[in-house]
């Protein structure tokens, strides 16, 4: 029972995590214009992995996709790749784990087969979560580097009469969604791996043995005794918090930008 609960919870947690990774990948707010210590502008810039947007104070939002592949920074391409790999692995993991669930009977599938599938999906979830966390962290690192570079530019080279508003970018909502989602997928994967141990019982069947008592022809046959050892069945209650992310896509598509570097 505990094994089923652990496996089921692992599946649900991973499902939420992968949904979060997909949401984060699609979100436009990976980086948002830094408003602190900047002139108050009547426009707000934010960028995603696939397009960048500008929201005007008047209410109009315009987004433009990055229609170039070669012109984009290698780091951005790497983040895209990591997120997509994470989604693909997670999706395959979910598919495998559905068939591995103890509560679902498919034909005459052996427990050992289910255990192997549970382990496989668990590993896939772990790798998927790590991919998402890595992708988001690489992007965050890129933002931090660019932030300090643009901050340095703000305080140097101001000898000219004309000032230019230096748009600096900071962490967007998608980064936090990605981190939380990656973490959930990772936890779900670990839970699946733990559940796998409980699904692979070591079976010892004691065959019937005849004891001949002297003078009597009475055979003593104890019933077939099955000893199963359950590992890792003491799953603790975990409260999972899903960072409620809101994607805002009120786009009335008009134009935008590609300046990550």
């Amino acid at each position: 029972m505990a094994v089923t609960a652990c496996q089921g919870l692992g599946f649900v947690v991973s499902l939420i995590g992968i949904a979060g990774i997909i949401a984060a990948t699609c979100m436009d707010q990976w980086s948002t214009q830094d408003l602190y210590n900047n002139p108050v502008t009547a426009v707000f810039n934010y960028q995603g992995l696939w397009r960048s947007c500008v929201r005007e104070s008047s209410g109009f939002t315009e987004c433009r996709g990055y229609f170039t592949l070669l012109g984009l920074p290698a780091m951005l391409q790497a983040v895209r790749a990591l997120m997509i790999v994470g989604i693909v692995l997670g999706a395959i993991g979910l598919l495998v784990s559905i068939f591995a669930l103890k509560c679902i009977r498919i034909g005459s599938m052996e427990d050992s087969a289910k255990a192997n599938m549970t382990l496989t999906s668990g590993i896939m979830f772990i790798v998927s979560g790590l991919c998402a966390i890595a992708g988001v962290s690489v992007f965050a690192n890129m933002l931090v580097t660019n932030f300090w570079m643009s901050t340095a530019n703000m305080y140097t080279g101001m000898g000219g009469m004309v000032q230019t508003v230096q748009t600096r970018y900071t962490f967007g909502a998608a980064l936090f969604v990605g981190w939380v989602a990656g973490g959930l997928t990772l936890i779900g994967g670990v839970m699946m791996c733990i559940a796998c141990r409980g699904l692979a019982p070591e079976e010892t069947n004691y065959k019937a043995v005849s004891y001949h008592a002297s003078g009597h022809s009475v055979a003593y046959k104890p019933g077939g005794f099955k000893a199963s050892t359950g590992f890792g069945s003491n799953t603790k209650n975990k409260k999972i918090y899903d960072g409620g992310a809101r994607t805002e896509d009120e786009v009335q598509s008009y134009p935008s930008k590609h300046d990550y570097v």
Epitope: Q33, A42, S57
Partner: antibody, heavy 117, light 113 residues
Framework: QVQMKESGPGLVAPSQSLSITCTVS????????VTWVRQPPGKGLEWLGV???????NYHSALTSRLRISKDKSKSQVFLKLSSLQTDDTATYYC???????????WGQGTSVTVSS | DIVMTQSPSSLTVTAGEKVTMRCKSS????????????LTWYQQKPGQPPKLLVY???TRESGVPDRFTGSGSGTDFTLTVSSVQAEDLAVYYC?????????FGAGTKLELK
């Protein structure tokens, strides 16, 4: 179709407060903002402030302490309140709707306000 | 605050003539996010409210005759009237629509010879 109409007192005594109402139709105040602009007689345009669809406001730095802009979405009305009036506050006051590029695409006809004792 | 400087303050022209007025801002009005310049041009005739002509420095508002052309980027902008008509006689204002407060220029008055 978008329409905007300002209504004000016409004459206000110095040191008093000025209250002007802008009644709009053809668009929602929850979605779009309303900007206030004034024009002293024979002079240029002066941007006063704006209230955006989400209720946030921005004011001209020189008027921050004296100016308040608010709205009543249910009545489709925007209010301008300018306190401690001086004679140089005499102007035609316009309300306008910001559109694409934050440009003011619709304007009211304006209401003339004279600050005099 | 951003200072918007318009030149010349007045222009006397003959009908059919090409006219150019300038607007200079003390800070760049170019938004890196969409590579658009948040500068707007208005036309105001006597006794009337201003009328929007051009936004984003070069995008003509619908219904505005194509003889009006906005151009420029960063801090220097121009409004060109290719062939001045009698109905174009008015005061033309530029406005910063990028950094608060959204200041106006002092205006350029277009007069007929």
């Amino acid at each position: 179709q978008v329409q905007m109409k300002e209504s004000g007192p016409g004459l206000v005594a110095p040191s008093q407060s000025l209250s002007i109402t802008c009644t709009v139709s053809g668009f929602s105040l929850t979605t779009y903002g309303v900007t206030w602009v004034r024009q002293p007689p024979g002079k240029g345009l002066e941007w006063l402030g704006v209230i955006w669809g989400d209720g946030s406001t921005n004011y001209h730095s020189a008027l921050t302490s004296r100016l308040r802009i608010s709205k009543d979405k249910s009545k489709s009305q925007v209010f301008l309140k300018l306190s401690s009036l001086q004679t140089d506050d005499t102007a035609t006051y316009y309300c306008a709707k910001p559109g694409r590029g934050n440009a003011l695409d619709y304007w009211g006809q304006g209401t003339s306000v004279t600050v005099s004792s | 605050d951003i200072v918007m400087t318009q030149s010349p303050s007045s222009l006397t022209v003959t009908a059919g003539e090409k006219v150019t007025m300038r607007c200079k801002s003390s800070q760049s009005l170019l938004n890196s996010g969409n590579q658009k310049n948040y500068l707007t041009w208005y036309q105001q005739k006597p006794g009337q409210p201003p009328k929007l002509l051009v936004y984003w420095a070069s995008t003509r508002e619908s219904g505005v005759p194509d003889r009006f052309t906005g151009s420029g980027s960063g801090t220097d902008f121009t409004l060109t009237v290719s062939s001045v008509q009698a109905e174009d006689l008015a005061v033309y204002y530029c406005q910063n629509d990028y950094i608060f407060p959204l200041t106006f220029g002092a205006g350029t008055k277009l007069e007929l010879k």
